[in-house]
Every structure is written in C-alpha cells, then in structure tokens.
Amino acid sequence: QESLSCDASGVCDGRSRSFTSIPSGLTAAMKSLDLSFNKITYIGHGDLRACANLQVLILKSSRINTIEGDAFYSLGSLEHLDLSDNHLSSLSSSWFGPLSSLKYLNLMGNPYQTLGVTSLFPNLTNLQTLRIGNVETFSEIRRIDFAGLTSLNELEIKALSLRNYQSQSLKSIRDIHHLTLHLSESAFLLEIFADILSSVRYLELRDTNLARFQFSPLPVDEVSSPMKKLAFRGSVLTDESFNELLKLLRYILELSEVEFDDCTLNGLGDFNPSESDVVSELGKVETVTIRRLHIPQFYLFYDLSTVYSLLEKVKRITVENSKVFLVPCSFSQHLKSLEFLDLSENLMVEEYLKNSACKGAWPSLQTLVLSQNHLRSMQKTGEILLTLKNLTSLDISRNTFHPMPDSCQWPEKMRFLNLSSTGIRVVKTCIPQTLEVLDVSNNNLDSFSLFLPRLQELYISRNKLKTLPDASLFPVLLVMKIRENAVSTFSKDQLGSFPKLETLEAGDNHFVCSCELLSFTMETPALAQILVDWPDSYLCDSPPRLHGHRLQDARPSVLECHQ
C-alpha cells in the first residue's frame, strides 16, 4: 500500500493509492486531504480525529458505504467536503453537525433514496455550494430536506428518478444564485417553479423531456422574481410544449437570457404564442443562445413568422451547430434590436445568406459570426453584407474560401475581420483598409505585405512567415501575435520600427540563435515587457549545440561572435 504525499503547506494527495481504509499517521498540520479513487468502504470515529485543522476533504469514488456518526466531529475548520460517487445508501445528520465552517458539500452520485430521516443541514450556516441526488434511486424531495439553508450560491439536484416532490420543499431557501435541476420529466416542474420563483437568479434545467409539459397558473401571489437566466440542456420539446413554456415567462419579468443547449425539438417550428401578453413580457430578454439543436425534421421547418414579434427586442442571438441554412429575409427585418448574431457551425452558403441579409435586415447589427459554414467566395460574402450599415465586426473563420481577389467591397464601418483557418495562401487588397483588428491565424501565408493604416491588432500565428512583417505596413500597430511560424530572428531595429507596439507574441518559432539575436536579447531586459510569452516559448532551433535552449539562457560562443 502506497503512502500519502504531502507538500509543505499541508496539501496531501492520496488519490488512487489502493487504500482500503483511511491511512494512519494523519496530523493537525494537514490542510487538505484527497483520498479519491480508493477502496476505503468505512470511515470510523477515530480515523480523522487528528485532522483538527483540515479545510478540504475529498473522498469521491472511494467505495465508502459506512461512515460512523461522529467520524467528522473534529473537523470544525472543514470548508470543502466531497463524498460524491460513493456507496452511501443513507445519509446521517450527525455527520454534518460539527461542520459549521463548511462552504462546499457534494453528496451526489450515492445510492440513497432520500436525504435522510431528519434535516441534514441545519448547522451548515456558511454553506455556499450543495450538490445532491443521483440518477437511479433518489426519488423524493421533502419539506425537511433543506431546513436551515437560507442562501446558496450553487445548488445542484440530480433527481432523474423523482417520484414525489413535497410542495414548498425548496421555498425555505430564500436566495439561490444558480440552481441546476436534473429532472427526467416535467411532472413536478410547475410545483418546483412556484417554490423557487422568488429565490433563484439562474435556473438550469437538465435532461428533461418537456414534450408533455402543460402550463397551469401558478399558486403564487404577485411576485417579483429575481430570475435573470433560464437554461435548458439536453431537453426535449415539441411545438406545443414550447408554447406552454412561454407562458411561464409572465412570472419572470426580469429574465434577460435564455439558453437551449443540446436540445431536441420534435416539431416543425409551428409555434403559436397565443397569449399576446407573452409578447410584451419577453421585453427584457436580450440574449438567446441555441447550441446543437437537433430537429429530426429540420428540412420541413417553418419560417418562424409566428415568433417574429417575440424577438424584436432581443440584442444577442447565437444559433450554433443547428443545421441553419437560412434566416428568412422577413425574419431578419424583424430583428430590429439585434446587435450580435452568431451562426457558427451551420450550413449557410452565399445564395441563402443574400436572402438573410436582405435590404433592411438586422438594422442594428454590429457583430456577425459565420464561422465554419459553407461560404466559398470572400468577394460575394462582402458584397452581400453591404446591407448591414452598422456592422463593425465580422468573423468568417473556418470557411474554405477560394483564393481572394484583388478587390472586394465590405460594410463601410467594418473594423474587425476574422479570416483564421480559411486556407488562404496570399493576402490581397480585398482586405479592407478600414480594419483595426485582423485575424489571419492558422492559414498558409508565407508573407504579409498589405498596407493597413488603421490596424491596431494583427493575429497571424500558425502560418509560414520567415520574418516579422514590415513595420511600415502598420503604423499604429499595438498588438501582434505571430507564434508558430518560421521566424528565425528579430532585431532591435525591427522591433524599434513599430512605434506603438505594446504586445508581441512570437514564441514557438524556429529561432536561429546567432550572435546578433543572442546579444540583442541579453542587452534588452525590457523584452519581457513586450514579449508576453517570454522566455519559455522562445527556444533556439539552431545551431545544433543550442537546440532546445531558451534564448534567454543560450550563450553565444566567444569564438564565433568575436571573429
């Protein structure tokens, strides 16, 4: 059996050491003890007695099935306790009585059915994070379960086999910053929602099949809900249940952000938000994020005209990796307040983009992200987007473009352009001179000779440049990142010719550690202020005797350098 390894500050690591019991020889000097991934099975009343100053105890995945009632009695300083993924089929309030300093408690992934016969947490007045529940056996949430807890930063409840929720069980916690609920179905959702309405600021619902969700008015008085964000992850919806979910919004008037992540819509987008008051009550929602939305019949999907009015005030929309091939012109025109639109990892092509960015589309749009779509022509893309009079930032990275032409048209206010990972070999005057930020990293560029008078930031890492670009091309450049190219040297003159350069990242290049380069780096201690990744990323490639040495440490041969 291996032993613990402890550092000078009292942090002890005993992970995966094949311990079959709590190791002996624990002392009051220990501040943190991690015994995860062992086969401990049992914690006796004297096992941790000596650890009076312990602040962190991690016992996850250690096959613990029994803990004596007074096993933690000496741990009054403990702030972090992780008992997750063990074999505890019942929980005892006597474990937690002495733990008055506890801030973090993880009991998730143990095979208990309830949280115990009496309240577990009445003494945990400092608790900030609580994780409870499991996938298969945790079946009942009762009113006594959260007694004594008044305020939590994070509460995560995995209740994927919930059979009973006692009304008002969660109501006793007056303030919860972030509540994550893993529920397999919507049976108790309305009851829970009513109980958390006045306490939760961010509600995250995971793995819930909402296909049969039906709204009914909540038994609550006029309530001012603090909820700002609502997220659905791994949920299943239908057109009908989406309409029903919308009706919940009348209770959360301060909601500003809605997120759907890895959800399935078994429908066609035939939404019909019947209640006109829903429209006005969506007024504060500014951010809608949809990632990996799976629509089995996406090819039959509706034009969403029924929800146009719902989204008129939204400022930020992300629809990522969801097979989007068209935003209908009329929809784009209704998105009057939209400032940020991210359509990354979709199926957009120029022909449909032209319809999406029609005259009057997205009139307030400032940032458009079309990364990893199916765009081919930079010239066409720029031309199509001329309708976007307020566009300042465009990301068309990770599209495979044809070689760029000599001239292109772009929205006149455009200041930021991301062309990273687009396979470009040559930059031409197609790139607009108005740019302040240009990202051409991860391409096949072996030179860069384009005059960009306003450029402040150039990102050109992971290319094939052999030298730093000429400083006269960028008279106001502040930042250049040119890592992982084939740059062999830089000199005082080169760096000095960038009058405003504040940040240069040029590590992981093929530096030839010549007398000139090494004497320059030795004579210029101020390099550390401008080279953000100095010194660890600056290694000699040649000569062979210095290969792999840091430039900072490499010493030129007196013989070579004083000939």
Epitope: N134, V135, E136, T137, S139, L160, S161, S184, E185, R206, D207, T208, N209, A211, R233, G234, V236, D262, T264, N266, R292, H294, P296
Partner: nanobody
C-alpha cells in the same frame, strides 16, 4: 417500434475488458434515450448507465463509474458499453433499454433487449 439486440457478453478475467453492443432496428433510434441495466443471479435488476439522444449527456451507477463508458453511434443505430477493470461483482446479465426519459429508473424504459451474459472470474 424499436427492437434491441445485445451482443459482446462472455467470460472475462478480473481486471479485463469487454465491449457490449446493442443494435436497434428502425429509423427512430436517435429519438430514444438509451440505458444499460444488469441483473445478477438472485438479485434485482439494477441501473448501470444512460446516454441521451445526442450522446451529449451520460451518467453511471456509482458501482461502475470510472470503469465503464457508454457511447452511441446514431448513424449505425447502436449503443455501446465499454467495460474495463472488470470485477467478479460485475457478473450479471446485461440488458439494453430504450425510452423517452433520461433516468436510471428501469420502469421508465419501454423497450428492452433479451440480455447478454457477462461472467468475470477471479
């Protein structure tokens, strides 16, 4: 209606590995949550693992977590259970199940395979 057929069971040494497969018929495989359960002789059927429709969420029984991995290939209508560091206590008949709900509660699964036996010898 979806039909499920498990394969890949057999005899393994303690500390060894097996990969179970569950092939589903029909074109609606990706609409189902898939679970693995097991039943040892003289014991009740118990939850092993679950995976959601996209494969983006997975969960495990505490008794197998860190040793078993569930994954699915929706293009091939198949869900897999990769079992490593096998122990004699893992000896059981392993069943694959399909349902609408992401849960470890076996009563919520509508479709079941016939099972594939796994024996782990010490």
């Amino acid at each position: 209606e979806v039909q499920l057929v498990e394969s890949g069971g057999g005899l393994a040494q303690a500390g060894g590995s097996l990969r179970l497969s569950c092939a589903a018929s029909g074109r609606t495989f990706s609409r189902y949550v898939m679970g693995w359960f097991r039943q040892a002789p003289g014991k009740e059927r118990e939850f092993v693992s679950v995976i959601n429709r996209s494969g983006g969420s997975t969960d495990y029984s505490t008794y197998v977590k860190g040793r078993f991995t569930i994954f699915r290939d929706n293009a091939k209508n198949t869900v897999f259970l990769e079992m490593t560091s096998l122990e004699p206590e893992d000896t059981a008949v392993y069943y694959c199940a399909a349902g609408e709900y992401y849960t470890g509660d076996s009563s919520r699964y509508d479709h079941w395979g016939q099972g594939t036996p796994v024996t782990v010898s010490s």
